[in-house]
């Protein structure tokens, strides 16, 4: 068995974020069994979890993980120092902020310590695997009789993010959504004062600093409308 998915030269968006190589073997044995794929996500560039499906192994196996950065000053092979476990079997590795280099090619190697020839290596572009924390501190301002402005904060460099706002009224069956750039504000020009509105936001590390496909979790919703506070109609922020 010799599986190689090579990344062609060119654009990130036309290639996989990894390629996988499996050590060739001379005879069919346990070492021909493919190792599970490693999936890594960088959470708000605070830590990274690289995980694999430990239950895909034919028998419980404490697979080991090594990593390094290709063609860089950080190309020394590192052992995982903080394993994640599933039912007492290794199922992942957590790397801390100081070990994360977003703009260098991350190489991760999974190995069966009982069968050292059984190993798989993947290359990952970490800037495409960043997931920010959900937006926080949603606030609504009434700009005029019929116009609302929604603002929020991110625990992140704003220029690196894009956002998706969803809103609906109690009369709606589905959400209306609007893409928003790094400026983290959204205006709704026409608000019906007889309806109650719900807004929520999520964010993504895209496009200036990376090409992440995964969105953050949704923010806590915020509400505005017929049964909200009468005391200060010009500034209102209410958690669900």
């Amino acid at each position: 068995l010799n599986t190689t998915i090579l990344t062609p030269n060119g654009n990130e968006d036309t290639t996989a974020d990894f390629f996988l190589t499996t050590m060739p073997t001379d005879s069919l044995s346990v070492s021909t069994l493919p190792l599970p794929e490693v999936q890594c996500f960088v959470f708000n560039v605070e830590y990274m979890n690289c995980t694999w499906n430990s239950s895909s192994e034919p028998q419980p196996t404490n697979l080991t993980l090594h990593y390094w950065y290709k063609n860089s000053d950080n190309d020394k092979v590192q052992k995982c120092s903080h394993y994640l476990f599933s039912e007492e079997i290794t199922s992942g590795c957590q790397l801390q902020k100081k070990e994360i280099h977003l703009y260098q090619t991350f190489v991760v190697q999974l190995q069966d310590p009982r069968e050292p020839r059984r190993q798989a290596t993947q290359m990952l572009k970490l800037q495409n695997l960043v997931i920010p924390w959900a937006p926080e501190n949603l606030t609504l301002h009434k700009l005029s009789e019929s116009q609302l402005e929604l603002n929020w904060n991110n625990r992140f460099l704003n220029h690196c993010l894009e956002h998706l706002v969803q809103y609906r009224t109690d009369w709606d069956h589905s959400w209306t959504e609007q893409s928003v750039d790094y400026r983290h504000k959204f205006s709704l020009p026409s608000v019906d004062g007889q309806k109650r509105y719900t807004f929520r936001v999520r964010s993504r590390f895209n496009p200036l600093c990376g090409s992440a496909q995964h969105w953050s979790e949704w923010s806590h919703p915020i509400h505005w409308g017929s049964n909200t506070s009468k005391e200060n109609p010009f500034l209102f922020a209410l958690e669900a």
């Epitope: 654009n11 990130e12 560039v45 063609n71 860089s72 280099h101 977003l102 703009y103 260098q104 090619t105 572009k125 800037q127 992140f156 460099l157 704003n158 220029h159 690196c160 200036l208 600093c209």
Partner: nanobody, 117 residues
Framework: QVQLQESGGGLVQAGGSLRLSCAAS????????MGWYRQAPGRQRELVAR???????YYSTSVKGRFTISRDNAKNTLYLQMNSLKPEDTAVYYC???????????WGQGTLVTVSS
């Protein structure tokens, strides 16, 4: 504070070429990601291209195959070679830089590119 200064913009006919430069006030080897974005009047900003310190580049679909981004760490300069220009490429082009820590986002004053038909 990092200063980035763009140059090379101007008026060009459709099908023509321009080369934009972005000079940095510090060693760009310390800037892990550099790129170009553009903004046309009344439009949201749009990523054009970006390149890591290791030379790994990315292009938006609208410019892929026509534009080439490169960086010269010895000259502390980022470049954008623009070929086969189209009227819809008309915009102010900004260069930007981001350290790996994401502690800051640096960008320049911009240079205007006008493509006439």
């Amino acid at each position: 504070q990092v200063q980035l200064q763009e140059s090379g913009g101007g008026l060009v006919q459709a099908g023509g070429s321009l080369r934009l430069s972005c000079a940095a006030s510090i060693s760009i080897s310390k800037i892990d990601l550099m790129g170009w974005y553009r903004q046309a009047p009344g439009r949201q900003r749009e990523l054009v291209a970006r390149v890591t310190n290791g030379g790994d580049s990315y292009y938006s679909t609208s410019v892929k195959g026509r534009f080439t981004i490169s960086r010269d760490n010895a000259k502390n300069t980022l470049y954008l070679q623009m070929n086969s220009l189209k009227p819809e490429d008309t915009a102010v082009y900004y260069c930007y830089g981001v350290p790996e820590s994401l502690a800051a986002f640096h960008w320049g004053q911009g240079t205007l590119v006008t493509v006439s038909s």
